[in-house]
Interface confidence: low
């Protein structure tokens, strides 16, 4: 007589998480009499998935009516597939007895579950850094399957290449996670810059997921200071200005000191943005020259974003003839304050 064959026509089936999976199985003969059972895995630790005669398998239904006379189709449908359902499924024929005896197994069908990656979450450095410094951004996405995945980093639309990416675990798993770190060298124009982590996966059908981070959260642009004296007024008052330029973020405190003594303290607020996202601020101080016998040393002291204070000093010459003092005289400084074209 013809030898019984248990036919599982598909070596593998791939299903998106949440969908139903159909695992096909037919037998070549009705003889000998005995049940068909479905298992996940092989060997002694295998897991019973479906047995018509007994048990409760709410997510598993037979494709054909197994009670129908001369039925040779023992395919099953598993609903609401999750990554945990991945594995190799075997259709096994038993000979009726007490107990039933395993007669023959199909070759097995490997069920792989396509699970979408979670939305990428991008995190930046804990503390701000200044231009020229390298900062790291991290991108994480979880729960995807199969393992193959592509992750790219962009800064303002340009792909970054100083990137390190790991997919875990290295071995076989029901689902995987990806973690990538991108190193970005900051420039002073990065207040308006953005880094994007882009994840492409077979489950996304060509529409990658993106996570973003604004470099404004990571950058500090230190201010430029310039102290200048305007022309002497008729009432013997000198107007001295402290120009604080090209700084970010806006958190800034300015203190005027006259001969080392605090004269006035101001906090920057509601400043208009420069084109590059930085801020400028000008503070004025009126000095009554006639109230001083000696030259007055004025200091503009700026504390920016919790950093150590930066000072710029200027001496108002009381001995000089007031009316002859030139307008817009720049304070002496340790370095040039000009910018080339900005």
């Amino acid at each position: 007589e013809e030898e019984l064959q248990v036919i599982q026509p598909e070596k593998s089936v791939s299903v998106a998480a949440g969908d139903s999976a159909t695992l096909n199985c037919t037998v070549s003969s009705l003889i000998p009499v005995g049940p068909i059972q479905w298992f996940r895995g092989a060997g002694p630790g295998r897991e019973l998935i479906y047995n018509l005669k007994e048990g409760h398998f709410p997510r598993v239904t037979p494709v054909s009516d197994p009670t129908k006379r001369n039925n040779m189709d023992f395919s099953i449908r598993i609903s609401n597939i999750t990554p945990a359902d991945a594995g190799t499924y075997y259709c096994v024929k038993f000979r009726k007895g007490s107990p039933d005896v395993e007669l023959k197994s199909g070759a097995g069908t490997e069920l792989s579950v396509r699970a979408k990656p979670s939305a990428p979450v991008v995190s930046g450095p804990a503390v701000r850094a200044t231009a020229e410094h390298t900062v790291s951004f991290t991108c994480e996405s979880h729960g995807f399957s199969p393992r193959d995945i592509t992750l790219k980093w962009f800064k303002n639309g340009n792909e970054l290449s100083d990137v390190q990416t790991n997919v875990d675990p290295a071995g076989k798993s029901v689902s995987y996670s990806i973690r990538s770190t991108a190193r970005v060298v900051l420039t002073r124009r990065d207040v308006h810059s953005q880094v994007i982590c882009e994840v492409a996966h077979v489950t996304l059908q060509g529409d990658p997921l993106r996570g973003t981070a604004n470099l404004s959260e990571a950058i500090r642009v230190p201010p430029f200071l310039e102290v200048t004296q305007q022309s002497m007024r008729a009432d013997n008052q000198v107007n001295v200005t402290c120009q604080v330029t090209k700084f970010y973020p806006q958190r800034l405190q300015l203190t005027w000191l006259e001969n080392g003594n605090v004269s006035r303290t101001e906090m920057a607020s509601a400043l208009p943005e420069n084109k590059d996202g930085t801020y400028n601020w000008t503070s004025w101080l009126l000095v009554n020259v006639s109230a001083h016998r000696d030259d007055v040393k004025l200091t503009c002291q700026v504390e920016h974003d919790g950093q150590p204070a930066v000072n710029k000093s200027f001496s108002v010459k009381v001995s000089a003839h007031p009316k002859e003092q030139g307008s817009n005289t720049a304070a002496e400084n340790t370095g040039t304050n000009e910018r080339n074209i900005y």
């Epitope: 231009a131 020229e132 303002n156 340009n158 290449s161 124009r189 430029f224 910018r339 080339n340 074209i341």
Partner: antibody, heavy 116, light 110 residues
Framework: QSVEESGGRLVTPGTPLTLTCTVS????????MHWVRQAPGKGLEWIGI?????ATSYATWAKGQFTISKTSTTVDLKITSPTTEDTATYFC?????????????WGPGTLVTVSL | QIVMTQTPFSVSAVVGGTVTIKCQAS??????LAWYQQKPGQRPKLLIY???TLASGVSSRFKGSGSGTEFTLTISGVESADAATYYC????????????FGGGTEVVVK
């Protein structure tokens, strides 16, 4: 405010050569500096930058072939192992205060000829 | 990496006429673009930065426009002194770039 290159000469292939850019009227602690070259009859080719803090970046083709360094008033470009294709006029140019943007002060250039 | 492509390679102009030079960036560079003029045997000179801002001392006959990936330099009322090679340059970023300059456009004035 000006920059001027020096050190260009005729060298044989493989002989290292260092070009110097001397700046005046401004401080290298306030401005990034670039090196740009131009082969005879060809266009401008950016080589690299040295930032105010001393960090450097190079064009993809220039990495390993050139080294940029600086002192308080000079910026050096070392051509590690010149080939005939490095024959060009080499310019240094002042960039922006603390990063990269445009070049508004250029030196007159210094000619390097690499020949056997 | 950002690649700058300039067209045409060479252009002829008549005195009093208008010349248009185009520059294309392979990526969106916003307004971070400059134009330079270089006469034979001389150093380059900055004409325009931030795509449309005239550099100090440059004639208003030079006009820059565009943003993103397409940029134009227009020279109106061409003079014989405008004969030179013009280069565009992206000021956006220098990580992983081959060259920040376009290939150049020679302007010949007749």
């Amino acid at each position: 405010q000006s920059v001027e290159e020096s050190g260009g000469r005729l060298v044989t292939p493989g002989t290292p050569l260092t070009l110097t850019c001397t700046v005046s009227g401004f401080s290298l602690s306030n401005y990034a500096m670039h090196w740009v070259r131009q082969a005879p009859g060809k266009g401008l080719e950016w080589i690299g930058i040295i930032y105010t803090g001393g960090a450097t970046s190079y064009a993809t083709w220039a990495k390993g072939q050139f080294t940029i360094s600086k002192t308080s008033t000079t910026v050096d470009l070392k051509i590690t192992s010149p080939t005939t294709e490095d024959t060009a006029t080499y310019f240094c140019a002042r960039g922006d205060r603390d990063g990269y943007a445009y070049f508004n002060i250029w030196g007159p250039g210094t000619l390097v000829t690499v020949s056997l | 990496q950002i690649v700058m492509t300039q067209t045409p390679f060479s252009v002829s102009a008549v005195v009093g006429g208008t010349v248009t030079i185009k520059c294309q960036a392979s990526h969106n560079i916003g307004s971070w673009l400059a134009w330079y003029q270089q006469k034979p045997g001389q150093r380059p000179k900055l004409l325009i930065y931030d795509a449309s801002t005239l550099a100090s001392g440059v004639s208003s006959r030079f006009k820059g426009s565009g943003s993103g990936t397409e940029f134009t330099l227009t020279i109106s009322g061409v003079e014989s002194a405008d004969a030179a090679t013009y280069y565009c340059q992206q000021g956006y970023g220098i990580s992983y770039v081959h060259n920040v300059f376009g290939g150049g456009t020679e302007v010949v004035v007749k």
